[in-house]
């Protein structure tokens, strides 16, 4: 006999970095039939919706209308069908941002490499905070953090042209309070013979930093889902 | 701006019954999930009762389930809270709070958590005697 449902999938709109004071969705999809949806917030319940009639919806949403530190953490969901309780969604980093400074990014050697070079990427925040993160532009950018006093370094080793784009880094001040965006570092890589076209991206995934640089010019962009960044198992 | 007052509160004893009321003014008060939560002589604030702004959804804590109801009235911007069967440990002081920012809240969801609201009373205190 069945013990649980299958878990529901949990993500943010319009993305899981919300700059401060800016509004964020956080949506829950689990099955139709379900009575009620809970949000789970550092492991407390946060919220509660018994969607109606809940036999025609299977999503939910959380809007949150105001982004601050205490909101930042990590949420999950669960879902309930009849007395039969799912397994709890994978966990959603709610990150703010726009928080005290902004830091300074550069690269050596430089902008412009030869494919095969070896790049490194700094990230440089004279205030207190002892992590950085650098993200690429992209629908499949992923977030690599770096660690040091007022700097952290980001080796890519020998580069290719999949390194080609715009990258951005931030300090943390926590793991979900970072620091305003630095400004754009284009990398432009050349000399592949094999490859000189940009590498394709991953289509099944929205553009990313185009999402969050929505949210900081515009506020709330509706009905652009967004998956969460830690992958759905 | 907003402003919550609360009142209703009282000295009973206990298995007597008690009605807290919420007037909200500054706001969209149809438009927005209320809470009420509470914080005995000692202890730390804590959720007591939820409901959504269309009244479907409510929510309680094990605590007071089967004793407590909220409610509200959307026309006279006011939300309730009727206690029945009060307790010794009934004893506290009461807020209502409301939650921030605008329109686009479910009609079906509630907040269970004090970080979720922006705006609260100055709270009503409840004491019950035996």
């Known amino acids: 006999q069945q013990q649980t449902l299958p878990k529901p999938f949990i993500w943010a709109e319009p993305h899981f970095m919300v700059p401060k004071e800016k509004q964020v969705t956080i949506c829950c999809q689990g099955n139709y039939g379900a009575v009620e949806y809970q949000l789970h917030f550092e492991g407390s319940l946060f919220a509660v919706d018994r969607p109606k009639p809940p036999e025609r919806i299977n999503k939910v949403k959380f809007y949150i209308p105001d982004m601050n530190s205490r909101m930042a953490g990590q949420y999950s969901c669960i879902y309930r069908v009849g007395e039969l309780w799912s397994e709890p969604s994978n966990l959603l980093d709610l990150v703010v941002t726009e928080m005290y400074d902004t830091p300074t990014l550069s690269v050596h050697p430089g902008p412009e490499v030869i494919s095969g070079e070896k790049v490194t990427f700094y990230c440089r925040l004279d205030t207190a905070t002892s992590m950085f993160l650098l993200l690429k532009e992209g629908r499949s950018s992923h977030v690599q953090r770096g660690y040091g006093k007022v700097q952290a370094e980001f080796p890519l080793g020998p580069v290719t042209t999949a390194h080609r784009g715009t990258y951005r880094c931030f300090g943390s001040y926590n793991n979900h309070a970072w620091s305003f965006p630095s400004e754009p570092v284009k990398l432009l890589v050349t000399g592949d013979i094999e490859n000189t076209s940009l590498a394709p991206e991953d289509p099944t995934f929205p553009d990313t930093w185009g999402t969050y640089l929505l949210t900081t010019e515009t506020g709330l962009q509706k009905d652009h889902a967004l998956w969460d960044h830690t992958a759905q198992n | 701006d907003v402003q919550l007052v609360e009142s209703g509160g009282g000295l009973v004893q206990a298995g007597d019954s008690l009605r807290l009321s919420c007037a909200v003014s500054?706001?969209?008060?149809?438009?927005?999930?209320m809470g009420w939560f509470r914080q005995g002589p000692g202890k730390d604030r804590e959720f007591v009762a939820a409901?959504?702004?269309?009244?479907?959804?409510?929510y309680y804590a094990d605590s007071v389930k089967g004793r407590f109801f909220i409610s509200r009235d959307n026309a006279k911007n006011t939300a309730y809270l009727q206690m029945n069967n009060l307790r010794l440990e009934d004893t506290a002081v009461y807020y209502c709070?409301?939650?921030?920012?605008?329109?686009?809240?479910?009609?079906?969801?509630?907040?269970?958590?004090?970080?979720?609201?922006?705006?609260w009373g100055q709270g009503t205190l409840v004491t019950v005697s035996s």
């Open positions: 500054g706001r969209t008060f149809s438009r927005l999930p």
């Open positions: 409901i959504s702004w269309s009244s479907s959804t409510t």
């Open positions: 709070a409301a939650v921030g920012g605008s329109l686009d809240y479910s009609a079906t969801v509630v907040y269970t958590a004090a970080r979720a609201y922006a705006d």
